[in-house]
Interface confidence: low
């Protein structure tokens, strides 16, 4: 068929960059070279359907499905996935080819399936089918690292029982707070399993393989720091190892540290001490409390005491099963078009959660921040003022949690009109949902003030796009108004918008658009 455009379908794999967000064109990601997916015409299909080669993707990988169209003139398009239509923004490359992209960030089971792309060009309409599945990595695992004491040495070994064999690294920081963020210059990384330097402020061990990266922080009580307003809490599951480090600095060596559980001294073999002089000749002591495999009776208040510092405690809670505690009731928000607003979820969880924010089938990176009271918070601010339904999903090894949010953007209606031989219809978004009035323009009423009440049919929420409602109003044609100009107006608390239509004409006649 001579009219058919030349189509190229490609797959672009991205190296994940956690600050990236799914977009239809430019995105801040490092990309591998595109892989050609063929895109052959599907035989025996009704209509023109191109089929791309099947795409297999690793869990958590980020990809772009891209179509390059060599066809004259403009194109318009629509993506459909699992019966939901998704926005599509074609653009043109340097060779003047139409380019349409679909970014899938951090691939999950829910994002696997058939992606249909409908393209309308000046010459013809056609469909492109992509099938995306998750590569079978059932044998792959990535377990959170844990600590063991090295036999006959004052050193910690970091272990992660994962497949494929993970790369283990220690992440060390001697600063406080914000400057211990992963990419800060204060952070030092050591790609080794054994760590001898155990005096640092912040010590984490991380393991990474094809499935991602998991980290465990060495729980620390610092007797020189002001205690938190709420008691620090450490959760562990039965059978996991317990490690707590108590650290204290004093002007000289004349002080000692001890651990107690519920006012009883820890047994020999459940603690070990190390000490060193710092550069300014002060003495640093650390005392580790450890249990190789915790049981329910290891629950309680662990207190570190010093002969020269106020003692501090931590509550250790041993649970049978992991948990995620948060309120899952859905929340609705209504904001102005330029109002700064973030969704937020406060939760307590163990083990640490993996989470995503989702809007209109797009997944966005999810960041967690620990609060002083043992809770964590995840915020999502990148809604770009798009109304609709937003989903927060969190899971760990033992629990799942989902919370729904609805975002409504207050704005005055915008009216679109269309007319047929028998009726005129007006459509509007805007929030709160608008009410409608119809007016007739005639010699008697040149300002279109004569209200029409007969034959008007209003439908609220006739179309829901990602949770965004649209309202419509239809005027059935009668002899009394045939040939006249009529005006439909949508109004809400933020304003009114009108469109004028000439009845009996083949299409909308935007005589005036009043705002």
């Amino acid at each position: 068929n001579q009219d058919l455009p030349v189509i190229k379908c490609v797959l672009i794999n991205h190296k994940n960059n956690d600050s990236s967000v799914g977009k239809s064109s430019s995105y801040p990601m490092v990309s591998e070279s595109p892989e050609d997916l063929g895109c052959a015409l599907r035989p025996q299909s009704s209509g023109t359907v191109y089929e791309a080669a099947a795409v297999e993707v690793d869990v958590s990988a980020s990809i772009t499905l891209q179509v390059l169209v060599d066809a004259p003139g403009n194109i318009s398009c629509l993506w459909v996935f699992k019966h939901s239509s998704l926005n599509c923004q074609p653009h043109f490359d340097l060779q003047n080819r139409g380019v349409v992209s679909m970014v899938i960030l951090k691939m999950t089971e829910t994002q696997a399936g058939e992606y249909l792309l409908f393209i309308q060009s000046e010459a013809t309409n056609y469909t492109i089918l992509f099938t995306v599945s998750i590569r079978n990595t059932l044998l792959y695992t990535l377990r959170r690292p844990y600590f063991r004491k090295m036999e006959n040495q004052d050193a910690l070994v970091c272990i992660s029982e994962s497949v494929p064999e993970p790369i283990v690294e220690w992440v060390l920081c001697d600063s406080q707070g914000e400057s211990c963020k992963e990419e800060s210059p204060a952070v030092v990384k050591k790609e080794e399993k054994v760590l001898h330097e155990l005096f640092g402020t912040d010590i984490r061990c991380c393991a990474r393989n094809e499935l991602g990266r998991e980290c465990t922080r060495l729980f620390t009580i610092d007797l020189n720091q002001t205690p938190q307003t709420t008691l620090p809490q450490l959760f562990l599951k039965v059978g996991e190892p317990l490690w707590i480090r108590c650290k204290a600095v004093h002007v000289n060596h004349g002080f000692g540290l001890t651990w107690e559980l519920e006012n009883k001294a820890l047994e020999e073999g459940n603690y070990f001490e190390m000490s060193t002089y710092s550069t300014n000749r002060t003495m640093i002591r650390i005392l580790f409390a450890f249990v190789s495999s915790v049981a329910r009776n290891d629950t309680g208040y662990y207190t570190c005491s010093s002969s020269k510092h106020p003692s501090q405690s931590a509550l250790v809670t041993i649970v049978e099963k992991g948990f995620i505690n948060a309120t899952n009731s859905s929340e609705d928000y209504e904001i102005d078009q330029y109002e700064e607003f973030c969704f937020s979820v406060r939760f307590k969880a163990y083990p640490q959660i993996r989470c995503t924010w989702t809007f209109s089938r797009k997944s966005f990176p999810c960041e967690q921040k620990g609060l002083d009271n043992g809770y964590s918070i995840s915020k999502f601010c990148n809604h770009k003022h798009q109304p609709g339904e937003y989903i927060f999903h969190a899971e760990n090894d033992d629990a799942q949690f989902t919370k729904m949010f609805t975002l409504n953007i207050r704005r005055k209606p915008q009216v679109l009109a269309e007319a047929s031989a028998s009726q005129a219809s007006c459509f509007s978004d805007g929030y709160p949902l608008p009410s409608w009035t119809w007016k007739k323009c005639s010699d008697k009423s040149p300002n279109c003030t004569e209200e029409i009440t007969e034959g008007v049919w209003n439908r609220k929420a006739n179309r829901k796009v990602f949770g965004q409602w649209v309202s419509s109003s239809t005027l059935n044609m009668s002899e009394a108004i045939k040939g006249f100009l009529v005006k439909c107006c949508a109004y809400n608390s933020l304003g009114t918008s009108c469109e004028t239509i000439l009845l009996n004409s083949p299409g909308p006649f935007p005589f005036i658009q009043d705002n």
């Epitope: 600050s19 967000v21 977009k23 064109s25 430019s26 995105y27 801040p28 914000e178 904001i335 330029y338 109002e339 700064e340 607003f341 973030c342 937020s344 921040k369 609060l371 918070i377 601010c381 990148n382 770009k384 003022h385």
Partner: antibody
């Protein structure tokens, strides 16, 4: 309409502390970050830090870390900036600013508070 | 931190002329497909006033003669035809990442 009203000018001795207040009105206080920016006489603008009043989460400029504390009182819609261990080079006009993240279309600033550090 | 360098430090022009102010970032201020670069005007004794946000979007009530362009690391503020009230100091401010940073300012003075 949105208003940010700051406390009056202060004269302080070196080594002391100053606490400047910024009372917000005309908008939902917890929906916007509040920034603090200072400007020494004849100099440029310098960002000190910010607070999210909804959960009191703060970010500070490392240059001031340890000396600056930003707080917010939701009940009175007031943000505070406290600067300790004052030195003569801290003499400046201190502004609070309600500033959105990407949609900065409407950002509002207080009238400024002059803090003079002098022995 | 992201360092912003403005040029020129001083620009001497007459009313009616076109002004072009430049701001260069030490690394890209783009994220989520948005350039987190903003331009402010400050007159003596006054708080700064937002002119342009997200590199090219106009702030509320800003005259059309002020426009912004650029992405990544290079940004420009253009005043198409200078009015007497436009002579002031102009700052660029990046809001991509903490610490938010300002340029050192460009003084626009009457020739």
């Amino acid at each position: 309409q949105v208003q940010l009203v700051q406390s009056g000018a202060e004269v302080k001795k070196p080594g002391s502390s100053v606490k400047v207040s910024c009372k917000a009105s005309g908008y939902t206080f917890t929906s916007y970050w509040m920034h603090w920016v200072r400007q020494a006489p004849g100099q440029g603008l310098e960002w000190m830090g910010e607070i999210d009043p909804s959960d009191s989460y703060t970010n500070y400029n490392q240059k001031f870390k340890g000396r600056v504390t930003i707080t917010a009182d939701e009940s009175t819609s007031t943000a505070y900036m406290e600067l300790s261990s004052l030195r003569s080079e801290d003499t400046a006009v201190y502004y609070c600013a309600r500033s959105a993240y990407y949609s900065k279309r409407d950002d509002y600033w207080g009238q400024g508070t002059l803090v003079t550090v002098s022995s | 931190e992201i360092v912003l360098t403005q040029s020129p430090a001083t620009l001497s022009l007459s009313p009616g002329e076109r002004a072009t102010l430049s701001c260069r970032a030490s690394e890209s201020v783009d994220n989520y497909g948005i350039s987190f670069m903003n331009w402010y005007q400050q007159k003596p004794g006054q708080a700064p006033r937002l002119l342009i946000y997200a590199a090219s979007e106009q702030g509320s009530g800003i005259p059309a003669r002020f426009s912004g362009s650029g992405s990544g690391t290079d940004f420009t503020l253009t005043i198409s035809s200078l009015e007497p009230e436009d002579f002031a100091v102009y700052y660029c401010w990046q809001s991509k990442e903490v610490p938010w940073t300002f340029g050192q300012g460009t003084k626009l003075e009457i020739k």
